[in-house]
Interface confidence: low
Amino acid sequence: MGRLVLLWGAAVFLLGGWMALGQGGAAEGVQIQIIYFNLETVQVTWNASKYSRTNLTFHYRFNGDEAYDQCTNYLLQEGHTSGCLLDAEQRDDILYFSIRNGTHPVFTASRWMVYYLKPSSPKHVRFSWHQDAVTVTCSDLSYGDLLYEVQYRSPFDTEWQSKQENTCNVTIEGLDAEKCYSFWVRVKAMEDVYGPDTYPSDWSEVTCWQRGEIRDACAETPTPPKPKLSKFILISSLAILLMVSLLLLSLWKLWRVKKFLIPSVPDPKSIFPGLFEIHQGNFQEWITDTQNVAHLHKMAGAEQESGPEEPLVVQLAKTEAESPRMLDPQTEEKEASGGSLQLPHQPLQGGDVVTIGGFTFVMNDRSYVAL
């Protein structure tokens, strides 16, 4: 018929699925795309940058022993041939084809057509509602080994839900009759039959349903509560969550700082067993009796110290050794003259002699001193 068809031309290069079928030589850089529309029409398109301003011709045959026919149904792009539409009614055949520049073959190949099947979009889509379920049916395509996929969503859903069957009879359960749902349907070729290079059909038109009745559209955001209100609630919730998190973090930091600045004062009864029970709080007697390790000099004014309720605390605690830190002489002097001292919670080197308030202790490598 020699018709020049612009039907697919404009959209053809927007489609994916190009095959770089370079076979060396002149074929290099030629991109070919084959789509077998519904086992009815084969569309072969090419993109050969080297020949972008040339009317390439397409020659084909369906059997290896036939003579080549020339395409009579070309696709045009910017006034030049860019593809061919072939009538190939339900043929499970190999397409042998050659793209030529005059008599010179630019590209020659053979391909099983069904590997590039694109089924037609579902037709006669019908919805049958029963309480919280819907059965979506449509006319099965006239050939088999297909999957019929229904996607649906309500404005409450962030993405499409999907269900598929191998006939166009798909029941979706667990729907909320009060919600508005959008549906669309498409057909896909089974990969294990047709291979991985097929194309899904175009989607059917989106249909919206609520309470078993068709709607023009579903509101973009759910109606109850109002869209702006729901956004406000979401933002407010996030802000409150952030504030609470920051508050908890602040409290935790504050607790850490407090613990660092004002260490906990343990009960001396548990740290110095027998000091109060046997020696009635006489520390010198207790230390002599229990350890007998150091000579203690009684400070002047030590008699005025308060009783067992407020003893000088020397905390011996198990702690992991960090970088050992010695007390410098100035610090010792301050303490001796009654100045307040805050010692860091770092362990001191084992075996060091420490004098505090006139008492001298030998510290092991697992001990630290705290006031």
Partner: antibody, heavy 120, light 107 residues
Framework: QVQLVQSGAEVKKPGASVKVSCKAS????????MHWVRQAPGQGLEWMGR???????ADYAQKFQGRVTMTRTSISTAYMELSRLRSDDTAVYYC??????????????WGQGTLVTVSS | DIQMTQSPSSLSASVGDRVTITCRAS??????LNWYQQKPGKAPQLLIY???SLQSGVPSRFSGSGSGTDFTLTISSLEPEDFATYHC?????????FGGGTKVDIK
Amino acid sequence: QVQLVQSGAEVKKPGASVKVSCKASGYTFSGYYMHWVRQAPGQGLEWMGRFNLHGGVADYAQKFQGRVTMTRTSISTAYMELSRLRSDDTAVYYCVRERQWLVQDYFDYWGQGTLVTVSS
Amino acid sequence: DIQMTQSPSSLSASVGDRVTITCRASQSISRSLNWYQQKPGKAPQLLIYAASSLQSGVPSRFSGSGSGTDFTLTISSLEPEDFATYHCQQSYSISVTFGGGTKVDIK
């Protein structure tokens, strides 16, 4: 060349059933719908239903529901049986192949027709 | 079901005339409309599919147009073999329906 060849004319009594066959040749693929359309004398065309030769599934026109059955014995031979015949079922019955083209479909090949006469 | 109304139901014309037949659907059927020609004692034959696509082998004097609910079949210059009955058919709905037919006879 695609051909749909139907069985010969039938004369039936009211209340009886008729079974018309349609044998397809000239194409190998089972993936087609076969439709049945009838035409009463001097009247227009009336669609009765479709039958998927591949899947063996039928859709019937509401008017014929419960009275018509479409079947096949192989992928190339389809049957239409109409039961409880009445005199107004007198018509030429056609089997028709549906071609699906992209998102459209149409009847590209028709059988020669089978005249069914219902008369007491 | 979608109702298809064809008009006129019959018309008389002469060879060389331009003939227009219209078909109206009771609801929108997009472009899912086909036209068939039927001669006495014969099965119908496809002329136009998808509202305006000419079936292979059909003379170019036949053309179709329209979408939605209103469609037209035009024969630009009537030939003697064109005297026949013309049927429109919608394939949009799962239940296929035909128009009542338009008989074109010799004036």
